[in-house]
Amino acid sequence: WELTILHTNDVHSRLEQTSEDSSKCVNASRCMGGVARLFTKVQQIRRAEPNVLLLDAGDQYQGTIWFTVYKGAEVAHFMNALRYDAMALGNHEFDNGVEGLIEPLLKEAKFPILSANIKAKGPLASQISGLYLPYKVLPVGDEVVGIVGYTSKETPFLSNPGTNLVFEDEITALQPEVDKLKTLNVNKIIALGHSGFEMDKLIAQKVRGVDVVVGGHSNTFLYTGNPPSKEVPAGKYPFIVTSDDGRKVPVVQAYAFGKYLGYLKIEFDERGNVISSHGNPILLNSSIPEDPSIKADINKWRIKLDNYSTQELGKTIVYLDGSSQSCRFRECNMGNLICDAMINNNLRHTDEMFWNHVSMCILNGGGIRSPIDERNNGTITWENLAAVLPFGGTFDLVQLKGSTLKKAFEHSVHRYGQSTGEFLQVGGIHVVYDLSRKPGDRVVKLDVLCTKCRVPSYDPLKMDEVYKVILPNFLANGGDGFQMIKDELLRHDSGDQDINVVSTYISKMKVIYPAVEGRIKFS
């Protein structure tokens, strides 16, 4: 019996087609992805093959103005239109709190939403009961398939799930659910979830009875043969894990941003064992036409976005200096504003010992593309912020050793004075440079804001200590020559859309007046 699994993950609000790098579509003839194109391909496969499941492994939320404006209603609407069979909850589904998940998505989705390792307690337990499930058994052709969901247990550090949801260990939570399905004669089981490729592989290895793992969170690109675009494969598709009980378990993920549709064919024997598995992600390029009815719907929903872009988010009473002449040479108040917003967006009081789990921000000055003049009545709009942060990136959470941070700050000024983008703006960090010293030895003082303290203060950076830092995904991926970050990071979790982080902060503050305050000094 053959099953076709179509899968997406980490779509992050890319409802419209995008450029090849998943930013805003500029030249339509070279654009990719988007729900209208995805629907065309899905329907083509559904018509051609008998037993097809369309699954999403989480993080539909967060990433473009679509999410900022529609807050998840767009996800429910267009996933319903595409007739997804199931979705696992990702960490970003909690970005607007539990209410922001329940109302727009859980109550409106016409497909099961899954996670076996999220347990509700207190008053939330009855409110959320039945809105998401640990698993769902689906009839597919003449067989039944069990789909068991899971979500990163780091979600409380990455999003806003509140205090009434407990995120359990994935393997511990999945095993009893799979065991139960087995006793009920469900012998084909897919684990669908959002904990990253390493955990996906661990689930394949450790959870007895799981036949296939469809994952997300780590934006992992797997491919067999010559890859069709710029993404470099982390391994073959499917990636085969040998389980502890000796079975070959295919593990898949489909990069991110709706650029690819994962396509996996599994052959099962009559006892539900996987005999073979093969496939590849399908690049959703312009050779696949956009479905006209979905496209028309997208255009209808788009109207509200254009109106939103010009509405006032808040006011500034000072000039927001985002000029290259400032931000690539010295501390600039636009850099301070953005870093303050990045930290504010990551306030999670999850432990009494820590005032927050992260206190530091770094931001490449080259990523700041425009100032905002306060003389326009002080008005700040989404349009203004899109000029400052035009690349559609995210502000991510990483864990780095102090020694890596020291290298990053040396790199920040290794060729100072040439207006290059790697000069770092900061938050929760005090750095002193001596430019008379040779490159690689110019950081003379590097103090960082403590987190395990009741009164935050600046202490010298310790080389062997592990620190959490918020930074643009561009830096986490080694951009602007920050190869040491990419090579040495100990953990990387993708965060919220850059403009959304800053716009939310400005809306919250109402009036802003960031200053240059001595975060970066030269001796």
């Epitope: 559904r46 008998p50 037993n51 007739r83 016409k110 497909f111 099961p112 009961s129 039945g130 499930l133 640990p134 698993y135 058994v137 689906l138 009839p139 597919v140 052709g141 003449d142 067989e143 039944v144 139960k180 399905l181 009920l184 004669n185 469900v186």
Partner: antibody, heavy 118, light 107 residues
Framework: QVQMKQSGPELVKPGASVKIPCKAS????????MDWVKQSHGESLEWIGD????????IYNQKFKGKVTLTIDKSSSTAYMELRSLTSEDTAVYYC???????????WGQGTSVTVSS | DIQMTQSPSSMYASLGERVTITCKAS??????LSWFQQKPGKSPKTLIY???RLIDGVPSRFSGSGSGQDYSLTISSLEYEDMGIYYC?????????FGGGTKLELK
Amino acid sequence: QVQMKQSGPELVKPGASVKIPCKASGYTFTDSNMDWVKQSHGESLEWIGDINPNNGGTIYNQKFKGKVTLTIDKSSSTAYMELRSLTSEDTAVYYCARTNWDYAMDYWGQGTSVTVSS
Amino acid sequence: DIQMTQSPSSMYASLGERVTITCKASQDINSQLSWFQQKPGKSPKTLIYRANRLIDGVPSRFSGSGSGQDYSLTISSLEYEDMGIYYCLQYDVFPRTFGGGTKLELK
């Protein structure tokens, strides 16, 4: 509005077969599975099976395997249930019911009474 | 197969009264539970699915609750047209299984 229309009562002889139609209207036929349910006189309900109108895929209650065949005709938006080798035990009212996105039955046909008697 | 035990099997109630019927599954059914109303000589009518979601057009006096193995249907203020037999159904796994029914009659 969503409707499932079933045929009138059937009086059949033991050993014979009967094929009950269920014509759907008011929605896209291929978007929802169809379940079938048996109700013997004065008894509770028994789930017989489920059919996917897209591909004709069926899931049967083990108890009815060999007794029942579910089929569909997409062109007329009609689901069929065939009962064979009929005995008095098969005397009952048979219902078709559409299932929603959650595979929960939402709209029911009016039922077809089958009486097996010589 | 999962067994569904409904209680009571029959009950009498007065108009305006609050009525609760319960259904217990032989194991956790993950809120995959529906409630139906059947009147004599008629086909069942679906009231609720996913334990607490009302089918369009069903009066708001009907509500469902519960999780795990235990579920209930409540009629907040009984009306004459609510008389009939009520059934629960688990659709968590195959085969789907119904409860034995609760006959609701006027006191």
